[in-house]
């Protein structure tokens, strides 16, 4: 089967894993979001928009 990480979906140097539940990103320090697309601000807040119901940062997207 195709490697879901082949397209490098995790931004800003995040690591992609092909978990059986769906691809998973582990973000580099300083970034967050399901695809590591959002910077973490120095004060600890982030530019992360409100997550859809039931979806937490880091959860797989099928």
């Amino acid at each position: 089967r195709a490697d879901p990480c082949a397209a490098r979906p995790c931004a800003h140097g995040g690591r992609c894993y092909a978990h059986f539940s769906g691809l998973v990103c582990a973000c580099a320090p300083g970034y967050m979001g399901a695809r590591c697309e959002f910077p973490v601000h120095p004060d600890g807040a982030s530019a992360l928009p409100a997550a859809p119901p039931g979806l937490r940062p880091g959860d797989p997207q099928r």
């Epitope: 490697d3 990480c5 690591r15 992609c16 894993y17 092909a18 978990h19 059986f20 539940s21 691809l23 998973v24 582990a26 973000c27 320090p29 937490r56 940062p57 880091g58 797989p60």
Partner: antibody
Framework: QEQLVESGGGLVQPEGSLTLTCTAS?????????MCWVRQAPGKGPEWIAC???????TDYASWAKGRFTVSKASSTTVTLQMTSLAVADTATYFC???????????WGPGTLVTVSS | QVLTQTPSPVSAAVGGTVTISCQST????????LSWYQQKPGQPPKVLIY???NLEIGVPSRFKGSGSGTQFTLTISGAQCDDAATYYC??????????FGGGTEVVVK
């Protein structure tokens, strides 16, 4: 069936060196994993040593392991752990383990025993 | 990163409930990248729970994980003799760092 098998353990003298090999079967490192080494001294808990991310070859080490331990990918199915300046305290069973997401080790090898003694 | 577990040993009767706690000195990645393992002598650890509360495939439903951030719990409901083992928590942290707890021995009588 996905499997990991460690080899290369044995008796080594203090200040000696040893290279352990982890061989994967049933899968290859063409997919992205953290291939890691974990050790467990007799009667103690597991202790993380190092990982190599097969996606780009980057490596990460426990703070205490930097400098004496080197993890590398030898082929599409083998990972090695080079250990130098070994001490009696390094006596342990060394396990190879795989993280395929969420930071946990879902696949382990049976381990190889390293004994450091004069 | 240090993970501190319930002191050993923890004893339970067959059919009883076992609760093991795991506290981290800092929040794990994503607040829930914490896993639990069972280990028996001569064997490698076997994962029971990943991402704090997800049951690994093939693991009996009497094992339940909960918690987030720095405080986590493993509960065994209806303990069986086969559950006698040492249990370890393991966290994953920002910066691609792993750490294990010291372990909790569970005795089932």
């Amino acid at each position: 069936q996905e499997q990991l098998v460690e080899s290369g353990g044995g008796l080594v003298q203090p200040e000696g060196s040893l290279t352990l090999t982890c061989t994967a079967s049933g899968f290859s490192f063409s997919s992205s994993y953290d291939m890691c080494w974990v050790r467990q001294a007799p009667g103690k808990g597991p202790e993380w040593i190092a990982c190599i991310y097969t996606g780009d070859g980057s490596t990460d080490y426990a703070s205490w392991a930097k400098g004496r331990f080197t993890v590398s990918k030898a082929s599409s199915t083998t990972v090695t752990l080079q250990m130098t300046s070994l001490a009696v305290a390094d006596t342990a069973t060394y396990f190879c383990a795989r993280n395929s997401g969420y930071g946990y080790f879902g696949l382990w090898g049976p381990g190889t025993l390293v004994t450091v003694s004069s | 990163q240090v993970l501190t577990q319930t002191p050993s040993p923890v004893s339970a009767a067959v059919g009883g409930t076992v609760t093991i706690s795991c506290q981290s000195t800092e929040s794990v990645y994503g607040s829930d990248w914490l896993s639990w393992y069972q280990q028996k002598p001569g064997q490698p650890p076997k994962v029971l729970i990943y991402q704090a509360s997800n049951l690994e495939i093939g693991v009996p439903s009497r094992f339940k994980g909960s918690g987030s951030g720095t405080q986590f719990t493993l509960t065994i409901s209806g303990a069986q003799c086969d559950d006698a083992a040492t249990y370890y928590c393991q966290g994953y942290y920002s910066g691609y760092i792993y750490a294990f707890g010291g372990g909790t021995e569970v005795v089932v009588k």
